[in-house]
């Protein structure tokens, strides 16, 4: 038998995908454990099985379907068990009714681009990857920029409070480079979380020119 | 609808081998847990081996542990069944089967099917 605290965290992309991750104090690293899946209105199951990803911690990903597909929507409820074998039978290490549209978590946004950049602004654009149409406008984002000599953690947040897949940064230093990143969080569901910032976009900004006052 | 394949079958002496391949189409490969089976002629379908949906479990009927392997590759959409010291009993049509669910798989009815290929192991 297993001992310890236990805790089982799932989040839906919302389109085809239920990420989870299992942690369990003093469970046994080599042991089969699986993610279960039970729709109450569907006729599929799913599975996946637990990987792991530190000491105490294993993580997968119940693929539904295809990543555009509308697997699930705001009425269904999901049963999730993680199930670790003992010998030849299977014991049930944790269980949750996992509504998806109140657990989100979406894709980071992808396809960045510098739209234009002058010496002292820069405007980016951005796409947001395998969210549901149902969200329809009800997205924010939050972007950040890494100027030189400082790290991500003090980069101070921008909250873009509508679905406005561009930004333009302004008060940049010429002829600097720098880095930006982007997450999104749809406004539904009491646990929805941000999804993972997006791959930095490097860009540097214009040389000011010669005997202009900058 | 997933489709699947199998190839790799034939006639082989006793204490030969086969690999047997299933490649799978129509549908995310990785959703999959992935099985073999096998008939006889005159005999129920049986279960001989399976592999998780990342390829890191795998499990075998007693009569084949330590002569087959079964294996995945999530980048080819293809599940193998490498069969090592074939024995005349091993003699069945060989099926590849896909269930998204893996405490489903063994029993046979919700899986979808290939179509089967021939080992004949002559002694």
């Known amino acids: 038998a297993v001992n310890g605290t236990s805790q089982f965290t799932c989040f839906y992309n919302s389109r085809a995908n239920i990420s989870c991750v299992w942690s369990q104090d003093g469970a046994l690293q080599d042991t089969s454990c699986q993610v279960h899946a039970w729709p109450d209105r569907r006729r599929w199951n799913q599975t996946c099985e637990l990987l792991p990803v530190s000491q105490a911690s294993w993580a997968c990903n119940l693929i539904l379907g295809a990543p555009d597909s509308q697997k699930l929507t705001t009425v269904d409820i999901v049963t999730l068990r993680v199930l670790c074998r003992e010998g030849v039978r299977w014991r049930v290490m944790a269980i949750q009714d996992f509504k998806p549209f109140e657990n989100l978590r979406l894709m980071a946004p992808i396809s960045l681009q510098v739209v234009h950049v002058e010496t002292h602004r820069c405007n980016i654009s951005w796409e947001i990857s395998q969210a549901s149409h149902y969200f329809e406008r009800h997205l924010e984002f939050e972007a950040r920029t890494l100027s030189p000599g400082h790290t991500w953690e003090e980069a101070p947040l921008l909250t873009l409070k509508q679905k406005q897949e561009w930004i333009c940064l302004e008060t940049l230093t010429p002829d600097t480079q720098y880095e930006f990143q982007v997450r999104v969080k749809p406004l539904q569901g009491e646990f929805t979380t941000w999804s993972p910032w997006s791959q930095p976009l490097a860009f540097r900004t214009k040389p000011a020119a010669l005997g202009k006052d900058t | 609808q997933v489709q699947l394949v199998e190839s790799g079958g034939g006639l082989v002496q006793a204490g030969g081998s086969l690999r047997l391949s299933c490649v799978v189409s129509?549908?995310?490969?990785?959703?999959?847990?992935m099985a073999w089976f096998r008939q006889a002629p005159g005999k129920e379908r049986e279960f001989v081996a399976v592999?998780?949906?990342?390829?890191?479990?795998?499990e075998y009927v007693d009569s084949v542990k330590g002569r087959f392997t079964v294996s995945r590759d999530n980048a080819k959409n293809t599940v193998y069944l490498q069969m090592n010291n074939l024995k005349p009993e091993d003699t069945a049509v060989y099926y590849c089967?896909?269930?998204?669910?893996?405490?489903?798989?063994?029993?046979?009815?919700?899986?979808?099917w290939g179509q089967g290929t021939q080992v004949t192991v002559s002694s």
């Open positions: 592999v998780t949906d990342s390829g890191r479990t795998t």
């Open positions: 089967a896909a269930n998204t669910d893996y405490f489903q798989i063994r029993s046979v009815d919700n899986n979808a």
């Open positions: 129509g549908d995310v490969f990785v959703r999959y847990t």
